[in-house]
């Protein structure tokens, strides 16, 4: 058999076959972090665990200083879940006091940074109003989708309030990407 | 053309090319559950439909007795959605009665069992406080991420309360995995 | 090296190797919807952006008139997020007026249409009761799973109420699919 016989008729020479096992992949898990200074209208980025527990990076996908570095151009599936937790939101306190009832919110954004482009690009956003009756609340926001990325792109996860992120368990808050 | 010409320069002989169509894959859908005994601090596992309707298993990925069996080592994307439904949570009843306001919660865990390892590993958890004002509530929890699994590993989905799971439709509650 | 040497022993001639880069893929993003007539018990389908911003279709995956067209049989991962937003749900208004407390809801359905089959098939559903205390609420519903599709199948996203869909940002509401 020649290699040609395994290739479908629309196989192009410029799109080489490659083993699935050598594709860039990462699954990062939550790590404790201290709140940092950030600009008022800019959501802070999360740090991640990249090698302990369930976390890993492989095949030239590297993690450094809050960023996943994309080592190869292509289409990637990117996902994250952030579990938030907090005390009763101000929303219900304001409501009890008879003042205008503007709900609090929790937001997760997966952001792409391209060195050649001045502004970060928001790839995915999950945002939810929080106006809970209970004294303690907790809930996840999950995101996932496919994007065309370029070698050198950097991915990060930003949240509306780091202090509300549940960092207690690696299965509750995570971030990953893999080349399709 | 020789097969070699399709292989990128970093292709290793030990990472063979393989057809995508022969990779282990499964999508399981909800079935009506028979309530089972389980330990107080251990969430019960769900049963699944594996061949009717939208459900399938293929390429040596098998389902047996609540478990998906991993037939081949590699990186898998694993996902599940569980739709919960219930009457007003005790939380709001307790609140109305002026008692301490501890919210109820709903939780989904995707768990890995490895025969050589004494205890299950929680891969993914989605947990949400439920403190609804309405008399009837319903909502999904979705989870999905990539993990490195070994041949022989078993996957299951555990929930905090089987009686709250919506088993009425195969598109509302499901569980799947596929080798990347 | 011959192509044969890259093929694992269970490689079948009828399951040809193929380059990942030439697989059908699409990521569609929200556009402002023009309200359309729809039957009372049938959820309306969303329109999508298919080429501007983050949106793309490639490798014979085409978008036309609310539908993603599947160009090749195989197993696809399909996903969507819809962010909803609204004013206080009737649920709490009804409750305050002392009338029966039926919660409102928001629902997303990913539907498959097969020309040879008379009825659409609901692949995925995310449905949530909305009974918010706050005057303005917003929240996403995310769905994603793997399905075996046939060449010629069409996919669409239906929602319970188009007027509640947040169409303001391409990262909040989206729809995608890719051949595995």
């Amino acid at each position: 058999l020649k290699g040609q016989e395994f290739a479908p008729s629309h196989q192009q020479v410029y799109a080489p076959l490659r083993a699935d096992g050598d594709k860039p992949r990462a699954h990062l898990t939550v790590v404790r972090q201290t709140p940092t200074q950030h600009f008022k209208n800019q959501f802070p980025a999360l740090h991640w665990e990249h090698e302990l527990g369930l976390a890993f990076t492989k095949n030239r996908m590297n993690y450094t200083n809050k960023f996943l570095l994309i080592p190869e151009s292509g289409d990637y599936f990117i996902y994250s879940q952030v579990t938030f937790r907090g005390m009763t939101s101000e929303c219900s306190e304001i409501r009890q006091a008879g003042r205008p009832n503007k709900p609090d919110s929790i937001t997760v954004v997966i952001t792409k940074v391209t060195d050649s482009y001045p502004e970060p690009t928001q790839l995915l956003m999950g945002t939810k109003s929080v106006c809970e009756v209970g004294s303690n609340w907790f809930q996840p926001i999950y995101l996932g989708a496919m994007f065309s990325l370029q070698e050198g792109d950097k991915l990060m996860v930003n949240v509306s309030d780091i202090s509300l992120v549940d960092y207690t368990k690696e299965d509750k808050t995570f971030f990953g990407a893999f080349l399709l | 053309l020789k097969g070699q010409e399709f292989a990128p320069s970093h292709q290793q002989v030990y990472a063979p090319l393989r057809a995508d169509g022969d990779k282990p894959r499964a999508h399981l859908t909800v079935v009506r559950q028979t309530p089972t005994q389980h330990f107080k601090n251990q969430f019960p596992a769900l049963h699944w439909e594996h061949e009717l309707g939208l459900a399938f298993t293929k390429n040596r990925m098998n389902y047996t007795n609540k478990f998906l069996l991993i037939p081949e080592s590699g990186d898998y994307f694993i996902y599940s959605q569980v739709t919960f439904r219930g009457m007003t949570s005790e939380c709001s009843e307790i609140r109305q009665a002026g008692r301490p306001n501890k919210p109820d919660s709903i939780t989904v865990v995707i768990t890995k069992v490895t025969d050589s390892y004494p205890e299950p590993t929680q891969l993914l958890m989605g947990t949400k406080s439920v403190c609804e004002v309405g008399s009837n509530w319903f909502q999904p929890i979705y989870l999905g991420a990539m993990f490195s699994l070994q041949e022989g590993d078993k996957l299951m989905v555990n929930v905090s309360d089987i009686s709250l799971v919506d088993y009425t439709k195969e598109d509302k509650t499901f569980f799947g995995a596929f080798l990347l | 090296l011959k192509g044969q040497e890259f093929a694992p022993s269970h490689q079948q001639v009828y399951a040809p190797l193929r380059a990942d880069g030439d697989k059908p893929r699409a990521h569609l993003t929200v556009v402002r919807q023009t309200p359309t007539q729809h039957f009372k018990n049938q959820f309306p389908a969303l329109h999508w952006e298919h080429e501007l911003g983050l949106a793309f279709t490639k490798n014979r995956m085409n978008y036309t008139n609310k539908f993603l067209l599947i160009p090749e049989s195989g197993d696809y991962f399909i996903y969507s997020q819809v962010t909803f937003r609204g004013m206080t749900s009737e649920c709490s208004e009804i409750r305050q007026a002392g009338r029966p407390n039926k919660p409102d809801s928001i629902t997303v359905v990913i539907t498959k249409v097969t020309d040879s089959y008379p009825e659409p098939t609901q692949l995925l559903m995310g449905t949530k009761s909305v009974c918010e205390v706050g005057s303005n609420w917003f929240q996403p519903i995310y769905l994603g799973a793997m399905f075996s599709l046939q060449e010629g199948d069409k996919l669409m996203v239906n929602v319970s109420d188009i007027s509640l869909v947040d169409y303001t940002k391409e990262d909040k509401t989206f729809f995608g699919a890719f051949l595995l």
């Epitope: 790590v31 404790r32 972090q33 201290t34 940092t36 740090h47 665990e49 090698e51 302990l52 527990g53 369930l54 200083n65 809050k66 | 390892y117 205890e119 590993t121 | -």
Partner: antibody
């Protein structure tokens, strides 16, 4: 949940060796780092070394040549052996699972999970 | 190796008192400092990491502050269960040195 259970108390003669075990549950020793810390009676805590998740080890230079850390992945157990014992080695020996945390752009290690301790008495 | 100097070595206080313990590093540890509580016959318990972040489940009466080489643990209103020995630990580099400890006793 995470637990580290250590072997029982030991009495040893000077010059002998002692091997303390730390059986963990709730995590795998191939996925997390297990450290050893000792505490002499009425004294402070002293870091001895670490068994990294990948199987490598690092030791405090003070104990270099006398301490050996090993593990058995099949039983999820880490061992610390200290040789050429002297009376000043009398202490409670703890295993601990390290945790990583970030401040600004740097990461640091602390010890959120500890074993119950093993008293080793060195006496002639 | 980084040296950690803790003071005082012991302190007597009453329930309801505010107590402060300090820890000085021999070089800048960039807020890579943790505080532990240890009761007799028990293992240490992590209270604070990153100089000022409260570990999950630790009461809010415990707080930490400091930067560079100087760090402080404060207990705002002592409770009976707080009488114990407290240790600081640098997490920047091996050998992850601990302070000698501060014994908090009932006056």
């Amino acid at each position: 949940q995470v637990q580290l259970v250590q072997s029982g108390a030991e009495v040893k003669k000077p010059g002998a060796s002692v091997k303390v075990s730390c059986k963990v549950s709730g995590f795998s020793v191939t996925s997390y780092n297990v450290h050893w810390v000792r505490q002499a009676p009425g004294q402070g805590l002293e870091w001895m070394g670490v068994m990294w998740s990948g199987g490598n080890t690092d030791y405090n230079s003070k104990f270099q040549g006398r301490v050996t850390m090993t593990r058995d992945t099949s039983t999820n157990t880490v061992y610390m052996e200290l040789s050429s014992l002297r009376s000043e080695d009398t202490a409670v020996y703890y295993c601990a699972r390290a945790g990583r945390y970030y401040h600004d752009s740097n990461y640091y290690w602390d010890f959120p999970y500890w074993g119950q301790g093993t008293l080793v008495t060195v006496s002639s | 190796d980084i040296q950690m100097t803790q003071s005082p070595s012991s302190v007597s206080a009453s329930v309801g008192d505010r107590v402060t313990i300090t820890c000085r590093a021999s070089e800048d540890i960039y807020s890579g400092l943790a505080w532990y509580q240890q009761k007799p016959g028990k293992s240490p318990k992590l209270l604070i990491y990153g100089a000022s972040s409260l570990q999950d489940g630790v009461p809010s009466r415990f707080s930490g502050s400091g930067s560079g080489t100087d760090y402080t643990l404060t207990i705002s209103s002592l409770q009976p269960e707080d009488f114990a020995t407290y240790f600081c630990q640098e997490g920047l580099k091996s050998p992850y040195t601990f302070g000698a400890g501060t014994k908090l006793e009932i006056k």
